[in-house]
């Protein structure tokens, strides 16, 4: 299996590539602005799963699927009530992933 640091590095590279693309991401689709501190990669995946027919984030979805660990006893206390553009969401996710990679257990 691929090591965790490499998977995180792959996600960072993928998210970086997406943010550098100037074209509107997923035709300007909106996603739930979830609390990454509370739910991590699992809630990020949940939010992005609601987007279909967007090849640009397919690889991100696949990587998140591998990083999400459903059995972790974490819970998001409140349901998200705000939607943001996918591009903004990707930027937040990139920041979250970078701090994990820099200060992870590796």
């Amino acid at each position: 299996s691929v090591s965790l640091p490499l998977t995180l590095k792959e996600l960072i590279e993928e998210l970086s590539n997406i943010t550098q693309d100037q074209t509107p991401l997923c035709n300007g689709s909106m996603v739930w602005s979830v609390d990454l501190a509370a739910g991590g990669f699992c809630v990020a995946l949940d939010s992005l799963t609601n987007i279909s027919n967007c090849n640009a984030i397919y690889r991100t979805q696949r990587i998140l699927h591998g990083l999400c660990n459903r059995k972790a006893p974490t819970t998001v206390s409140s349901l998200p009530d705000t939607k943001i553009e996918v591009a903004h969401f990707i930027t937040k996710l990139l920041s979250y992933t970078k701090q994990l990679f820099r200060h992870g257990p590796f």
């Epitope: 059995k71 972790a72 006893p73 920041s95 701090q99």
Partner: antibody, heavy 119, light 110 residues
Framework: EVQLVESGGDLVQPGRSLKLSCAAS????????MAWVRQAPTKGLEWVAS????????YYRDSVKGRFTISREKAKSSLYLQMDSLRSEDTATYYC????????????WGQGVMVTVSA | DIVLTQSPALAVSLGQRATISCRAS??????????MHWYQQRPGQQPKLLIY???YLASGIPARFSGSGSGTDFTLTIYPVQADDIATYYC?????????FGGGTKLELN
């Protein structure tokens, strides 16, 4: 239901070896980082060692480095702690735990197994 | 190593508020993410995760428990205290290895 069952605890003399085992069930063992946390009698908790889900990466506290070896066996869904050159200060209850690398906490815990190092 | 300091004991009455503190020898907050967690250990049992990342309730934990804080100062609050809350409470950091725990605060009844 997640279950972690430790075994192998014993009374041993200083300088001797002991191997602890932890049988995991109720979850996909190969998805999880695992760890050992110990608790000396009437004392607090102390992280001992962790291992990545693929078993490749291992992490130890300085006081056990070179003496303890953490390992895992996917086929048996088991975690191990080989303890060599045991010292009296290693006397403790040893807990097998799942370790959530993303959030940094120890989520599921076994009941613990007692290791006593004494002449 | 990051040292986490907790007061050894706290006496409370049932139905009252218990405030347990944990002070870190250096900041455990990175990029707004608090790397501090709380556990409960009842006598003769294994520890149980209560709060993660300073303020988020682990699943199955009643809302009587709450957490707050950032940087070096963190607090676990129990309100109202019930009989089965009598236990020792530990904070734990994952800012840097070795992952360390506080010495524990024993919650006792008045």
């Amino acid at each position: 239901e997640v279950q972690l069952v430790e075994s192998g605890g014993d009374l041993v003399q200083p300088g001797r070896s002991l191997k602890l085992s932890c049988a995991a069930s109720g979850f996909t063992f190969s998805d999880y980082y695992m760890a050992w946390v110990r608790q000396a009698p009437t004392k607090g908790l102390e992280w001992v060692a962790s291992i990545s889900n693929d078993g490749i990466s291992t992490y130890y506290r300085d006081s056990v480095k070179g003496r303890f070896t953490i390992s895992r066996e996917k086929a048996k869904s088991s975690l191990y702690l080989q303890m060599d050159s045991l010292r009296s200060e290693d006397t403790a209850t040893y807990y097998c735990t799942t370790w959530n690398w993303e959030f940094g906490f120890f989520d599921y815990w076994g009941q613990g197994v007692m290791v006593t190092v004494s002449a | 190593d990051i040292v986490l300091t907790q007061s050894p004991a706290l006496a409370v009455s049932l139905g009252q508020r218990a405030t347990i503190s944990c002070r870190a020898s250096q900041s455990v907050t990175i990029s707004r993410y608090n790397r501090m967690h709380w556990y409960q250990q009842r006598p003769g049992q294994q520890p149980k995760l209560l709060i993660y990342r300073s303020s988020y309730l682990a699943s199955g934990i009643p809302a009587r428990f709450s957490g707050s804080g950032s940087g070096t100062d963190f607090t676990l609050t129990i309100y109202p205290v019930q009989a089965d809350d009598i236990a020792t409470y530990y904070c734990q950091q994952n800012r840097e290895s070795p992952w360390t725990f506080g010495g524990g605060t024993k919650l006792e009844l008045n």
